[in-house]
């Protein structure tokens, strides 16, 4: 099938990093500078994404793959493909319309981005608070009060803090 297809369409032989050049009898020409083709059989190469201003280059463009951007220090990516950059806050804070604000009592944020989230309610799992929460850290839940009664054979190890949530990027 591949052989048949290539007889019908000479462009199918052009690998990634090249394009099928109609101006040169459909021979495979390398992608020009600052462009790429990530699949074979392309009739044009795509222009590379350019990371400038508040964006910086995380991965350089090559003839077969696009550039990737992230944000200048103090900012983090938001939106599809890092289409914008949002200011970082400190751990224990969240970004509001008025700037970075400390998490309210009973909430925490262990990242430089995203919102403050409520501490875990240990009692919902029948456990007790082993380590109190802070603005930067969730509470650590320990064994239930019943497990601590005299004669209990073992102590359940503390549950790990919840995996930090990640805002969509």
């Amino acid at each position: 099938f591949e052989r048949t297809r290539s007889l019908q369409d000479p462009c199918s032989n052009c690998p990634a990093g090249t394009f099928c050049d109609n101006n040169r009898n459909q021979i495979c020409s390398p992608c020009p500078p600052n462009s790429f083709s990530s699949a074979g059989g392309q009739r044009t190469c795509d222009i590379c994404r350019q990371c400038k201003g508040v964006f910086r280059t995380r991965k350089e463009c090559s003839s077969t793959s696009n550039a990737e951007c992230d944000c200048t220090p103090g900012f983090h990516c938001l939106g599809a493909g890092c289409s914008m950059c949002e200011q970082d806050c400190k751990q224990g804070q969240e970004l509001t319309k008025k700037g970075c604000k400390d998490c309210c009592f009973g909430t925490f944020n262990d990242q430089k981005r995203g919102i403050c989230r409520p501490w875990t309610n240990c009692s919902l799992d029948g456990k007790s608070v082993l380590v109190n929460g802070t603005k930067e850290r969730d509470v650590v839940c320990g064994p239930s009060p019943a497990d601590l009664s005299p004669g209990a054979s073992s102590v359940t190890p503390p549950a790990p803090a919840r995996e930090p949530g990640h805002s969509p990027q």
Partner: antibody, heavy 124, light 107 residues
Amino acid sequence: QITLKESGPTLVKPTQTLTLTCTFSGFSLSTTGVGVNWIRQPPGEALEWLALIYWNDDTYYSPSLKSRLTITKDTSKNQVVLTMTNMDPVDTATYYCAHEGIIGFLGGNWFDPWGQGTLVTVSS
Amino acid sequence: DIQMTQSPSSLSASVGDRVTITCRASQSISSYLNWYQQKPGKAPKLLIYAASSLQSGVPSRFSGSGSGTDFTLTISSLQPEDFATYYCQQSYSTPPTFGQGTKVEIK
């Protein structure tokens, strides 16, 4: 509040050099991520981007006009200057400067806000 | 350069109408697409950035959608002050390029 204002001659003769100044307030061109763009619009036509200078002196030019354009900044005066050589009647347009970068807590490659624009006519 | 094509080039509509303007890029530009409004004798004003984010102070009747090559600006209920020319612009690569504009006129 960010404001920008363009200034320069309203009439230029063919072959002469145009010098335009963008004077701005409300931001500093020494702040990371910030840039100033020049964009023009011939009467009744669409917008055309010309040039850009960033806080770190990185400059970008329209490929079709690169040989004729120079963009510079004076951070202490809050000014950006665009020079365009060998002016032609087809360069008659309203010339705008526009801020790019971080407003509030968000940044990206968009133009906001723009100056009011200055109409430059090229005629002998 | 990346070409941006807007359609229609002009349209007539009445106050209260729902208006849709489309913009097509000559290659994928992800979400690096901005929309501007320009009134006669005035500078353009940013409406939408990053394809769908509403600029501060812009009425919520304006919305943007799309990614890749096809994008849309929608005005849910046209108001008298919305009669203007609208431009899309890609910020994916240099040079940034604009569409040719869509003029929204009173029917």
